[in-house]
Interface confidence: medium
């Protein structure tokens, strides 16, 4: 289960994003257009720092389907 | 120096299960992820997996699911891939690779690689 | 077949420019951070270019990388025959079973 105190990297932080992801796929970086401001990728933000689960879920490739 | 050194050469017969070793040294072994690539003769690189040796976290390539297993002996500063149910197309050379995730996703030390034959 | 696309060999004659492409999708290339090796014959491979277009220390600069949508291209300048390898592209897929993915390998001839 994703602990959201703890900090994420390699293979540990792509096993977390398959899990919170699921079949939506997931991105190391944001496609440019869907942020407003450069970032510079899910390293930064949950490897060297920790980070929460809806940040992790802002890496999915494509929304949720709403129920 | 950092390197990374892998097991002898191993012959094995189908069906069989090989383990193949990886002794780290002039870094901290938990601090990195350890991967696991392979190559068939005159073929490309081809990987199999990762493991954390800190937690023992691994995720593997579903192409290998249910035949590989990665472990760990960080008093050791070892890393350990079994490969099971050998078949003549597991003939390759096998290699470990460091991790550093800090690098964004390149592993920059290599071992110098371990060839295992499956012949019967 | 490999996720990733590599010619599957280039040639150059020594002192000339050469460029190495490698194309993916979203799921891999365009979204995540690229990594090159080379793989001199006999040996392992050695990271050459990391995150798209750093090279790690003791690496000249007469390697370069570079991404754009979803390819990325290896530049090799001043071509050597010690650069007379196997090359390889490899990143990230983050489909549905995530893992590392390579470049079928592309082979320089330094003519």
């Known amino acids: 289960a994703y602990r959201p105190s703890e900090t994420l990297c390699g293979g540990e932080l792509v096993d977390t994003l398959q899990f919170v992801c699921g079949d939506r796929g997931f991105y190391f970086s944001r496609p440019a257009s869907r942020v407003s401001r450069r970032s510079r990728g899910i390293v930064e933000e949950c490897c060297f720092r920790s980070c929460d689960l809806a940040l992790l879920e802002t890496y999915c490739a494509t929304p949720a389907k709403s129920e | 120096q950092v390197q990374l050194v892998q097991s002898g050469a191993e012959v094995k017969k189908p069906g069989a299960s090989v383990k193949v070793s990886c002794k780290a040294s002039?870094?901290?072994?938990?601090?990195?992820?350890i991967n696991w690539v392979r190559q068939a003769t005159g073929q490309g690189l081809e990987w199999m997996g990762w493991?954390?040796?800190?937690?023992?976290?691994?995720g593997y390539a579903q192409k290998f699911q249910g035949r590989v297993t990665m472990t760990r002996n960080t008093s050791i500063s070892t890393a350990y891939m079994e490969l099971s149910s050998l078949r003549s197309e597991d003939t390759a050379v096998y290699y470990c690779?460091?991790?550093?995730?800090?690098?964004?996703?390149?592993?920059?030390?290599w071992g110098q690689g371990t060839t295992v034959t499956v012949s019967s | 077949q490999s996720v990733l696309t590599q010619p599957p060999s280039v040639s150059a004659a020594p002192g000339q420019k050469v460029t190495i492409s490698c194309s993916g999708s979203s799921s891999n290339i365009e979204n995540n951070h690229v990594s090159w090796y080379q793989q001199l014959p006999g040996t392992a491979p050695k990271l050459l270019i990391y995150?798209?277009?750093k090279r790690p220390s003791g690496i000249p600069d007469r390697f370069s990388g570079s991404k754009s949508g979803t390819s990325a291209t290896l530049g090799i300048t001043g071509l050597q025959t010690g650069d007379e390898a196997d090359y390889y592209c490899e990143t990230w897929d983050t489909s549905l079973s995530a893992g590392r993915v390579f470049g079928g390998g592309t082979k320089l001839t330094v003519l």
């Open positions: 002039g870094y901290t072994f938990t601090s990195y992820d």
């Open positions: 690779a460091r991790d550093p995730y800090y690098y964004y996703y390149g592993m920059d030390v």
């Open positions: 493991m954390n040796p800190n937690s023992g976290n691994t």
């Open positions: 995150d798209n277009n």
